[in-house]
Interface confidence: medium
């Protein structure tokens, strides 16, 4: 376990022409805050992928109002470090994402408005316990200067915070909940003097006078076991001075609940009971209230009457997510009827309607036949948002204005000859065929139900039906 720490030194317009004077230009007062997100590994992950190693939000910075005549000063920044606790081993390689957000404090409908000013994403290698690393990054016209480090929290030590540090005087038995125990290091610096009576086995301290408990132990002096299991007396592999095992891997092994949450097993999974001020599947989300301004993109934060109540972000159209952080693909809701094309213009949706439809959502089916007479006795048929003329015999074209040759489509079957006639067409059939279109074979023996030849045979083939 340990903490990733980020210190923002400055954020402001980068060098060069065209850089903005300040983030508040012509917008009235504003203030900045930062969000840090840590993702494991060096892969280029999607921006939406979760901050699996953790995330943190800074406090709001002081309110800043631009003075048009004055030279642009360094922007006032939030005080303090951004700290991202990590429970497991420090991965060494990680992606660091730092977002700079602007909170506009002018008269906004629904409260302050938030917008993302800059995002820098860098893949980094960093050993825990090392010195502060300094960096300067550009994001568009902005420049961000910052330092960062990862440090282990005792009793964890080492470049990945995986070794457990034991003061020379402490016994070498591991506490419950470690499976198997990490090797204990004897070469640790002398710890500070802990609170009087703090358990040497189950407690430790970083500051003089405190008593912090190892997993599995609680109480002011870390004397009270959280669960009844311990390494002693368990069946299975024997305990040694360097390690011990607890039975089988269970969902609560290693306590997946962060921030002091307690884990209880459920069928096939686990459930964390979080202390007040934290929530989430693993108690990983710190207690945020409306005062922290958690709703982005102009979302309205509605909070309960007391701190125990949840807050909720009501997002304006176009945004969603628990903090209104995601842009909605509003066209995915298919708001345009009758095959209209949806256009999301940001401030509004627009539907481009197919011919024959109108209205904001293409909901009105126009009377396609109105004023569209079909010539030469044709009748107008509506359908699919377009009109169509069903033409009288001898005429064709979109409006039945073209004289049609009824014989052009060769309507007479089996070699019959077609003659155009004022009322349509007449077929003169070849010998052996009959019907208006010469479609029926004539059989002198009267067996008209049989085909002229078996399937696949030509009439001249020797096989015959009997």
């Amino acid at each position: 376990a340990g903490v990733f720490e980020l210190q923002i030194h400055s954020f402001g317009p980068g060098p060069g022409p065209g850089a903005p004077r300040s983030p508040c230009s012509a917008r009235g007062p504003c203030r900045l805050f930062f969000r840090v997100c840590l993702k494991p590994g060096l892969s280029e992950e999607a921006a939406e992928s979760p901050c699996a190693l953790g995330a943190a939000l800074s406090a709001r910075g002081p309110v800043y109002t631009e003075q048009p005549e004055a030279p642009a000063p360094d922007l006032p920044l939030p005080n303090g470090l951004l700290q991202v606790p990590f429970r497991d081993a420090w991965p060494g390689t990680f992606s660091l994402i730092i977002e700079t957000w602007r909170e506009e404090l002018g008269d906004q409908i629904g409260g302050p408005a938030w917008s993302l000013l800059a995002r820098v994403t860098r893949r980094r290698r960093l050993a825990a316990g090392g010195p502060w690393a300094r960096d300067i990054q550009r994001a568009g016209a902005w420049e961000l200067r910052f330092s960062y480090r990862a440090r282990c929290e005792l009793p964890a030590v080492g470049t990945a915070c995986t070794r457990l540090c034991r003061p020379r005087s402490a016994p070498s038995r591991c506490g419950p909940g470690l499976r198997p125990c990490a090797p204990l290091e004897d070469e640790c610096e002398a710890p500070p003097v802990c609170r009087a009576g703090c358990s040497l086995e189950h407690g430790f301290c970083e500051q003089p006078g405190e008593c912090r408990c190892l997993e599995g132990w609680t109480g002011p002096l870390c004397m009270v076991p959280v669960s009844t299991s311990s390494c002693l007396g368990l069946r299975g592999p024997s305990s040694t001075t360097t390690g011990c095992l607890v039975p089988g891997p269970g969902p609560c092994d290693g306590n997946p609940c962060a921030n002091g949450g307690s884990c209880s097993e459920t069928p096939g999974s686990f459930e964390c009971t979080c202390p007040r001020g934290f929530y989430g599947l693993r108690c990983e989300v710190s207690g945020v209230t409306c005062a922290d301004g958690p709703c982005f993109n102009g979302g309205l934060c509605v909070g309960g009457a007391d701190p125990d109540s949840a807050y909720i972000c009501h997002c304006p159209p176009g945004f969603q997510g628990s903090n209104c952080e995601k842009r909605v693909d509003r066209c995915s809701l298919q708001p345009c009827r009758n095959g209209g094309l949806c256009l999301d213009l940001g401030h509004a949706l627009r539907c481009r309607c197919r011919a024959g439809f109108a209205g904001p959502r293409c909901e009105h089916d126009l009377d396609d036949c109105a004023g569209r007479a079909c010539a030469n006795g044709g009748t107008c048929v509506e359908g699919g948002g377009a009109h169509r003329c069903s033409c009288a015999l001898g005429f064709g074209g979109r409006n039945c204005r073209e004289r049609a040759d009824p014989c052009a489509a060769r309507p007479c079957a089996h070699g019959g000859r077609c003659y155009a006639h004022f009322s349509g067409l007449v077929c003169a059939c070849a010998p052996g065929y009959m019907g208006a279109r010469c479609e029926f074979p004539v059989h002198p023996d009267g067996v008209s139900a049989l085909p002229a030849a078996p399937p696949g045979l030509r009439p001249g083939d020797p096989q015959r039906y009997l």
């Epitope: 409908i109 979080c274 509605v302 109540s309 997002c315 997510g321």
Partner: antibody
Amino acid sequence: QVQLQQPGAELVKPGASVKLSCKASGYSFTSYWMHWVKQRPGQGLEWIGMIHPTLGDTNYNEKFKSKATLTVDKSSSTAYMELSSLTSEDSAVYYCARLGSLSMMDYWGQGTSVTVSS
Amino acid sequence: DIQMTQTTSSLSASLGDRVTISCSASQGISNYLNWYQQKPDGTVKLLIYYTSSLHSGVPARFSGSGSGTDYSLTISNLEPEDIAIYYCQQYSKFPYTFGGGTKLEIK
């Protein structure tokens, strides 16, 4: 399609408790807040509270804080509301409703009619 | 709590009519208002969210408008299936509150 199934009716005695269920299907149950709304006979709608299945967060109308307890069972995608110390004032239809991503109660259950009578 | 008032508790109109139902809030609610329809069998459906956005599947004859404290729902061409009680609901502040409802009947 999104469906919220509620039992049709419950008959309970004064002073007792009743646990109403709302089984969700057709969407990711753990991603949406679930609301509960009360409607007394011939009257309007009253918001009781809401619960988020993943976060476990709840928010109650102050008026119902000592009357209603909201819980969920994620494994069965079911939301529950327990009403305690029932009186005739609690005789009503109780609806569950999903809170859509744009802050509207976009799908409603059919409602459970609770009658408190000795 | 924010009080939502629907001054007209019942309203009678003819088929094909244009009907407007109004709703006022005891304080400004910045367009955070939804409209619901409750049919005689008790079924409740969302019609309009965020003052004027039509919920998917709702006929285009329904529309909403308003700002500040005053809002309205309009049915442009009344049809038989529109017989119902219509409720407005604010979500600007907890607790969420509904109007008393407007019962729409056919003349």
